[in-house]
């Protein structure tokens, strides 16, 4: 079956938006007014993954770009990156595990846990203008909660 996708933007729980920082990195910062147009629009695809009541497997691509968030080991540490893919083959229902995140949603707050590295989450720093990264702690200084805003296709 073809994969189902929705366009959306994400903001962290401090209302920081996500923008491109160079070709293969995202950063989080507060945006207002016209600057909101800078925020990245994701194509969230609902993909196959392990069955769980509270975790929905998704892939997060950048809308109209052949880039997907993926989780890989770099220097033995789980790391978030933007990975370029062949647009003829993506998105697909059976995404490779490095592209899959378990969306955990409670009261409209979302967390994105790496399927490849359980208990590692898409995270932002408290500080402004810092890279979006994969963090191994929840409830600490770093932010792992996001809100989602729908965007028209």
């Amino acid at each position: 079956a073809p994969v189902r996708s929705l366009n959306c933007t994400l903001r962290d729980s401090q209302q920081k938006s996500l923008v491109m920082s160079g070709p293969y990195e995202l950063k989080a910062l507060h945006l207002q007014g016209q600057d909101m147009e800078q925020q990245v629009v994701f194509s969230m695809s609902f993909v196959q993954g392990e069955e769980s009541n509270d975790k929905i497997p998704v892939a997060l691509g950048l809308k109209e770009k052949n880039l997907y968030l993926s989780c890989v080991l770099k220097d033995d540490k789980p790391t978030l990156q933007l990975e370029s893919v062949d647009p003829k083959n993506y998105p697909k229902k059976k995404m490779e595990k490095r592209f899959v995140f378990n969306k955990i949603e409670i009261n409209n707050k979302l967390e994105f846990e790496s399927a490849q590295f359980p208990n590692w989450y898409i995270s932002t720093s408290q500080a402004e203008n810092m890279p979006v990264f994969l963090g191994g702690t929840k409830g600490g200084q770093d932010i792992t909660d996001f809100t989602m805003q729908f965007v028209s296709s």
């Epitope: 079956a1 073809p2 366009n7 609902f46 069955e51 929905i56 969306k103 729908f150």
Partner: antibody
């Protein structure tokens, strides 16, 4: 609690159009797809299409393209389905239902149905 | 379109009996399968989604399972209020498609 309140029964002439409504209460309207389903005696249940009020995305069953037009008004938290060029084949009960935006929970809630009768 | 072949189309069963209704999908539906119950003149009521997850408030005598593309709804001990028509639905691929229904009556 969640409720989907549909508009009342309609008696229509062949060739006319009808617009039926589905008023949602008790949940975040923008985050659930509204589904439209047709039920005719002897024909079972047929899926017509869906709309996600949060972004206006619409998916139709090809069979109903040109027959059904689905819309939603977020300010009144109401979804609509217009049926055009009515014929006796369109005489049916039409239901609205909901499914969460990530498709996980199935058709969770249902309206009470709207009976459309097409007769000369 | 994905065809959902539901069987039996009708059946009689005794109170307390174990009842199983099946739906066969014509292709993979990635466990996006629901079961509904409908009583005469009423709207359908969702019992189960994603093959085996029970909707809140649905009695535990209802259960769902899958084997390949064969999906089953089981009522472990039939109660009088369980009579009605049961439908399956695949919501993996557009257009979503329903089974033809199983009319369950008390013997």
């Amino acid at each position: 609690q969640v409720q989907l309140q549909q508009s009342g029964a309609e008696l229509m002439k062949p060739g006319a159009s009808v617009k039926i409504s589905c008023k949602a209460t008790g949940y975040t309207f923008s985050r659930y797809w509204i589904e439209w389903i047709k039920q005719r005696p002897g024909h079972g249940l047929e899926w017509i299409g869906e709309i996600l009020p949060g972004n206006g995305n619409i998916n139709y069953n090809e069979k109903f393209k040109g027959k059904a037009t689905i819309s939603a008004d977020s300010s009144s938290e109401t979804a609509y389905m217009q049926l055009s060029s009515l014929s006796s084949e369109d005489s049916a009960v039409y239901y609205c239902s909901t499914i969460y935006y990530d498709y996980d929970q199935g058709f969770t809630y249902w309206g009470q149905g709207t009976l459309v009768t097409v007769s000369a | 379109d994905i065809k959902m072949t539901q069987s039996p189309s009708s059946m009689y069963a005794s109170l307390g009996e174990r009842v199983t209704i099946t739906c066969k999908a014509s292709q993979d539906i990635d466990r996006y399968l629901s079961w509904f119950q409908q009583k005469p003149g009423k709207s359908p009521k969702t019992l189960i989604y994603r093959v085996k997850r029970l909707v809140d408030g649905v009695p535990s005598r209802f259960s769902g399972s899958a084997s390949g593309q064969d999906y089953s709804l089981t009522i472990s001990s039939l109660q009088y209020e369980d009579m009605g028509i049961y439908y399956c639905l695949q919501y993996d691929e557009f257009p979503y498609t329903f089974g033809g229904g199983t009319k369950l009556e008390i013997k």
